[in-house]
């Protein structure tokens, strides 16, 4: 049993390393934003025993504009630096182990096609003919200037692009 993709959080990103049950992941506030005190950026893949369906817990995260950065001049659009936003310590901290490194899951990403469109984010939709996941363009509210000027970058996932001995953490919708 695996979890579907976690929910979106305004002004935050998350890189999901594992969709496995009990995996714990962390949202990161966008540059220029910080985590509001008293909110948690953590989410965990848990099982609803009544329905036998896995889901991500709802993070209480609120990303608010960082007053310390409000009056700073933005970086040039061609370069994005990493200064400014540091994840704050939380009472509930990740265990330190990386779920993605502990056990390989089935490779369900080989049929994924991603078209990264300038100024857009991507949303998955089920292909009725194949049942594989397709990624379609969806307008984003947090694209950067550099995204809107860059050319399209088409990704067609293929198992041949994996490094030797590497098993991608694919995700399959909960059954």
């Amino acid at each position: 049993i695996t979890c579907p993709p976690p929910m979106s959080v305004e002004h935050a990103d998350i890189w999901v390393k594992s969709y496995s049950l009990y995996s714990r992941e962390r949202y990161i506030c966008n540059s220029g934003f910080k985590r509001k005190a008293g909110t948690s950026s953590l989410t965990e893949c848990v099982l609803n025993k009544a329905t036998n369906v896995a889901h991500w817990t709802t993070p209480s995260l609120k990303c608010i504009r960082d007053p310390a950065l409000v009056h700073q001049r933005p970086a040039p659009p061609s370069t994005v630096t990493t200064a400014g936003v540091t994840p704050q310590p939380e009472s509930l901290s990740p265990s330190g182990k990386e779920p993605a490194a502990s056990s390989p899951s089935s490779n369900n990403t080989a049929a994924t096609t991603a078209a990264i469109v300038p100024g857009s984010q991507l949303m998955p939709s089920k292909s009725p003919s194949t049942g594989t996941t397709e990624i379609s363009s969806h307008e984003s509210s947090h694209g950067t200037p550099s995204q809107t000027t860059a050319k399209n970058w088409e990704l067609t996932a293929s198992a041949s692009h994996q490094p030797p001995g590497v098993y991608p953490q694919g995700h399959s919708d909960t059954t």
Epitope: D13, I14, N30, S31, T82, G84, T109, Q121, Q147, S158
Partner: nanobody
Framework: EVQLVESGGGLVQPGGSLRLSCVGS????????VGWYRQTPGKQREWVGV???????DYADSVKGRFTISRDNAKNTVYLQMNSLKPEDTAVYYC????????????????WGQGTQVTVSS
């Protein structure tokens, strides 16, 4: 077709520094997120860190405070600056172009570079 090419690896003494580069080429380099991974022989791949489109970053606990990820969109390049290197950082390092499944929600794709070897030894 998009290609990712890592470079900058090499042999370095403990406590030393290296900067790895991940260059994307193809029809363009409009990236939501780029992750770095590393792998040692016989072991499962380990996530190192990620940089998102806003420039915010996240790191594995094992490298936090020592490694820094940045990007230069004009050069279609993402960097992994590695400081205070330890023997246990020895691995082949890969970059990965993320797939965005929901707004702000990313995961690895099957697009990888060829990797670059980093060896930390005295």
């Amino acid at each position: 077709e998009v290609q990712l090419v890592e470079s900058g690896g090499g042999l370095v003494q403990p406590g030393g520094s290296l900067r790895l580069s991940c260059v994307g080429s193809g029809d363009g380099f409009s990236i939501s997120a780029v992750g770095w991974y590393r792998q040692t022989p016989g072991k499962q791949r380990e996530w190192v860190g990620v940089i998102f489109s806003s420039g915010s970053t996240d790191y594995a606990d094992s490298v936090k405070g020592r490694f820094t990820i940045s990007r230069d969109n004009a050069k279609n390049t993402v960097y992994l600056q590695m400081n205070s290197l330890k023997p246990e950082d020895t691995a082949v390092y890969y970059c990965n172009a993320g797939v965005t499944t929901n707004r702000g929600v990313h995961r690895e794709s099957n697009y990888w570079g060829q990797g670059t070897q980093v060896t930390v030894s005295s």
